[in-house]
Interface confidence: medium
């Protein structure tokens, strides 16, 4: 009995899937804006995924969590740079700068200790991480409301 039900369910799912494929193909051929809308939806999904990545950042109101995150990111960044993984290392350093209470001071220190090309890479990535922080804060405020 269970086997029969499973077979029916599988058949229904298969039929639905084939139906969806036919619908998708017809829509793609007949609607000139379909491709654009699809691209737009994928862009939105990508953005949502990136926003979901914000969970990596600590609760900015929790000083202890921020400090722990800061130290971990500096260390990870440092170790990755030592291994020649400059891109990844810089990503972690920018995370640390983003949650740092005195980013200007930290940047001055990093300017002295990092090789110039690495420091330049860091500067180019800063606006992106700053935007992430702003998004994280606004998302947190939305949650409160």
């Amino acid at each position: 009995m269970v086997g029969r039900n499973s077979a029916i369910a599988a058949g229904v799912c298969g039929a639905l899937f084939i139906g969806y494929c036919i619908y998708f193909d017809r829509k793609r051929r007949s609607d000139p804006n379909f491709k654009n809308r699809l691209r737009e939806r994928r862009k939105k999904q990508k953005l949502a995924k990136e926003r979901a990545g914000l969970s990596k950042l600590p609760d900015l109101k929790d000083a202890e969590a921020v400090q722990k995150f800061f130290l971990e990111e500096i260390q990870l960044g440092e170790e990755l740079l030592a291994q020649g993984e400059y891109e990844k290392g810089v990503d972690h350093l920018t995370n640390a700068i983003a949650v740092c209470g005195q980013p200007q001071q930290l940047l001055q220190v990093l300017q002295q200790t990092l090789p110039p090309p690495v420091f330049q890479m860091l500067l180019t990535k800063l606006p992106t991480i700053s935007q992430r922080i702003v998004s994280a804060q606004s998302l947190a405020e939305d949650d409160v409301e």
């Epitope: 130290l71 500096i74 440092e78 170790e79 740079l81 030592a82 220190v109 990093l110 200790t113």
Partner: nanobody
Framework: AVQLVESGGGLVQAGGSLRLSCVAS????????MGWYRQAPGKQRVLVAT???????NYADSVKGRFTISRDNTKNTVYLQMNSLKPEDTSVYYC????????????????WGQGTQVTVSS
Amino acid sequence: AVQLVESGGGLVQAGGSLRLSCVASGSTFSNFVMGWYRQAPGKQRVLVATISSGGSTNYADSVKGRFTISRDNTKNTVYLQMNSLKPEDTSVYYCNARRGSVIVPTLAYDYWGQGTQVTVSS
């Protein structure tokens, strides 16, 4: 992050010897100053001995001449050889790894093991 796992603790008679080991994983071991600390029940954790990445050692006065700290960077391991043990050496012994940040000199990274019990009976 660095993980530290101690071993070698146990029960020993006064005057006996024990050798503690601490294996580090997760980072470049040779960059760290390694140390052993101990904590007796109801007391604060205190320094026993440290060894720098270059091999320079430092000991608490109470263990000088009896304990020897050493490290093997190829095995990511630090050792504490404890001779002429006394009942007052009874404690939980903790392994510690510490290093300053290269890129942010004011920062230090500090890691601790879970501890290993050493009991010296009289």
